[in-house]
């Protein structure tokens, strides 16, 4: 389960993004040889600082559809 306001990195970050973004996917490509400029931001933000749900959602690939 997602735990708010803590650092997230490594596989745990990937798993959490998959949970938060669901079918939308998220902004980075693997393997590491293709680390993108955008993905650097989430590493800087989440691996070393408190990383909350709102921030994680900004890295989801497309906006969630409103009902």
């Amino acid at each position: 389960a997602y735990r708010p306001s803590e650092t997230l990195c490594g596989g745990e970050l990937v798993d959490t993004l998959q949970f938060v973004c669901g079918d939308r996917g998220f902004y980075f490509s693997r393997p590491a040889s293709r680390v993108s400029r955008r993905s650097r931001g989430i590493v800087e933000e989440c691996c070393f600082r408190s990383c909350d749900l709102a921030l994680l959602e900004t890295y989801c690939a497309t906006p969630a559809k409103s009902e």
Partner: antibody
């Protein structure tokens, strides 16, 4: 081709200082967390410290906290480890490695640089 | 912190033997488990990543399995060049990556 080349090791007395460097090439250095790992003679691998892609954030193992300082110069593609108040138990081969932050392995390592702390 | 344990700490085997090394994590790390080989005086070399994926150039006699907390590295038919130390590493939680204590494979 990705390359990591450590330097700066040597023999130092207890309480002394050393500065290690790791020159990186063949990849976008500024995109990666960079990490120092060490290995004492005949022992296993121990994570020492990591630094964020921009260099703005750092983390340390408890064993080196307050004595070691990690830094980087993205314009020179170089990682550093300033080691102060060295102890005999810091004797080890020091390796740098890159970390994507996305659960990838340490796919490239340097050859290591030996630090010996002895009187 | 996630703790990693390995067994055995050392083993003696002969060329052609099947060798199995196990690694256990103190909590689930899904499949974020990597295996390295290290020879004396050399840097570690990546063998297997994501628990079971063979790194490019690594012989197919090496294989990995497991998920969650329990993982295995198998060398199907030990070759002379395989006598070395082997380390597991979790990449589920980073920075602060942790390694297993290692397994030394020696000639019987």
């Amino acid at each position: 081709e990705v390359q990591l080349l450590e330097s700066g090791g040597g023999l130092v007395q207890p309480g002394g200082s050393l500065r290690l460097s790791c020159a990186a090439s063949g990849f976008t250095f500024s995109a990666y967390i960079m990490t120092w790992v060490r290995q004492a003679p005949g022992k296993g691998l121990e994570w020492v410290s990591s630094i964020s892609p921009s260099g703005g954030y750092t983390v340390y193992a408890d064993s080196v906290k307050g004595r070691f300082t990690i830094s980087r110069d993205n314009s020179k593609n170089t990682l550093y480890l300033q080691m102060n108040s060295l102890r005999a138990e810091d004797t080890a081969v020091y390796y740098c490695a890159r970390d994507s932050g996305f659960g990838d392995p340490f796919d490239y390592w340097g050859q290591g640089t030996m630090v010996t702390v002895s009187s | 912190d996630i703790q990693m344990t390995q067994s055995p700490s050392s083993l003696s085997a002969s060329v052609g033997d099947r060798v199995t090394i196990t690694c256990r994590a103190s909590q689930s790390i899904r499949n974020y488990l990597n295996w390295y080989q290290q020879k004396p005086g050399k840097a570690p070399k990546l063998l297997i990543y994501a628990a079971s994926k063979l790194e490019d150039g690594v012989p197919s006699r090496f294989s990995g399995s497991g998920t969650g907390t329990d993982f295995t590295l198998t060398i199907r038919s030990l070759q002379p060049e395989d006598f070395a130390s082997y380390f597991c590493q979790q990449s589920y939680s980073s920075p602060g990556i942790t390694f297993g204590p290692g397994t030394k494979v020696e000639i019987k």
